[in-house]
Amino acid sequence: IWELKKDVYVVELDWYPDAPGEMVVLTCDTPEEDGITWTLDQSSEVLGSGKTLTIQVKEFGDAGQYTCHKGGEVLSHSLLLLHKKEDGIWSTDILKDQKEPKNKTFLRCEAKNYSGRFTCWWLTTISTDLTFSVKSSRGSSDPQGVTCGAATLSAERVRGDNKEYEYSVECQEDSACPAAEESLPIEVMVDAVHKLKYENYTSSFFIRDIIKPDPPKNLQLKPLKNSRQVEVSWEYPDTWSTPHSYFSLTFCVQVQGKSKREKKDRVFTDKTSATVICRKNASISVRAQDRYYSSSWSEWASVPCS
Amino acid sequence: RNLPVATPDPGMFPCLHHSQNLLRAVSNMLQKARQTLEFYPCTSEEIDHEDITKDKTSTVEACLPLELTKNESCLNSRETSFITNGSCLASRKTSFMMALCLSSIYEDLKMYQVEFKTMNAKLLMDPKRQIFLDQNMLAVIDELMQALNFNSETVPQKSSLEEPDFYKTKIKLCILLHAFRIRAVTIDRVMSYLNAS
């Protein structure tokens, strides 16, 4: 058993049929010695008396808020949560496996630039009685500071019969140099509590590997005389690291109709303009990627050909 | 000695072309190592990230763009002498950088070159003949060093009398390649910045 936060404890259980469970001793936080009784949750049934209560925790029915009283007055609370281990593996029931970029990916993180700010998000089908707490650091043995905000519900989607909830959190490395060469990864730890179930999820990454620029901005078209060709120009996104001559981007320019299966014109360039063939009912799209370290492409910025 | 550098665009900052070739060569070599050594811990997640130049050179700090000198997190050990040497500057009057920057890059390359050559000698003794260093990568390191045109003492190639542990050597190769790729990215950024200055 260990303390998650003040008066909240996590009991780690091997989860299998007829498992013996864990013996837990609760101590009432009071100078009083006599006349103390214990109850669980909203029940008035007295579980025991005395300054300590020893319980055998085997299942979720044994978890919950234990309260010690004296003469009708509440003295203190201890909330017991369960963390299940099945076949030597901690349970991952609360969050959905996003399977990208690989199986068992529960947390996904992205950074728009090299400033040390990043966003992580996760998915769940659970809508109520759910809390998250996020901690982060650079490295684990001698951790350097990363400050994370509160996790918030950022999107709701309907997937078949189920509703899916996306939560996200923003974090900022306390002293980040955009030009630095990372040798220690960022560690992100998410504590998830659903009702009386506790789970924890972790992710480890270098900022350079989670870079995904914002789409290029200010796309403009200029038709070329006596030609079907169009000059398309754009600018670096405002959120990208500066100076741009040091943090350079490369671009993919594509002309395509509504359907992905339609024919297309595609060209790659390091410049902020390109010449392509425009077709009726097609769109010109441009996306960006770090020129020197190939992490993710940005989303497309698009304008209609006409 | 100023060696002429053949680049497609004659007005181009001479080292930019070489640094692009360097990044390409080390990226290709790393990809090849990952594929060939698929049963060894060779991915970014699996290896320890070591920097053989740590405490010996200061490339990131020395080559910091002017715009980032206002960022205190970037200034832990920054020197302030300006560039005065090295053929890559090709008579450009610029106060963005110090001699320290290009000489620091040169020293990085020299250290990696020695490590890679020592390692290659060991890998050539491996009866499995599983992986060797790409000669193109070694040639590209040499070309960029020549273009940088710094004179410095030659570092003797390390020789080891004991029987090489090929498993350890291959893991060390992965660690070196990952670190060198990251440094090659920095070098490319620096050259691109200089080219635009």
């Epitope: 079907r228 024919k263 014109d265 595609r266 060209v267 390091d270 | -």
Partner: antibody, heavy 118, light 107 residues
Amino acid sequence: QVQLVQSGAEVKKPGSSVKVSCKASGGTFSDYYLHWVRQAPGQGLEWMGWIDPENGDTEYAPKFQGRVTITADESTSTAYMELSSLRSEDTAVYYCARNKELRYFDVWGQGTLVTVSS
Amino acid sequence: DIVMTQSPLSLPVTPGEPASISCRASQSISINLHWYQQKPGQAPRLLIYFASQSISGVPSRFSGSGSGTDFTLTISSLQPEDFATYYCQQSNSFPLTFGQGTKVEIK
């Protein structure tokens, strides 16, 4: 299976014209760009131009501008390349090639040898 | 027009050995570079597109690399059926242009 089948070899006199055909099968004809590329005996490849069969849009290499005409007939899934004012240096194998991407070629015809000789 | 220069023009190789063909553009073309193989009396065949992207059905011993002005086609271990002429082609701008070809011959 996508296939491009070209018309047979031709022998032409200098100053005359030649029209080579390229019939496509497999896939929808208008879903692809169609190009013409030629190769003189023992020489390399030379791009001549492209057509979008969907709308008849064309683009020609400056070298051939004014001498080449590329057309397409959607009803028969056939593209044509006509080269006029032939000279001996136009002796070459003429290939049609197509792709959903405009700027490179993933399926080629078998080639048509055009010999220009007096 | 962008001029594509291949080297060497002729490459004698022993079967089973690796081979590398270089292609240089007269100006930067990012990764807008494609490789073709042509055997005598046959049409060219696409091997690699956008510098390094492999084509399904093309053996994995063929790989491409490069960006900007310098590109390489590598055949890791030459098989008897690989002896042919190889062309690079740029698609950065019209007119599309090819290298002059590299003939890979049996040593």
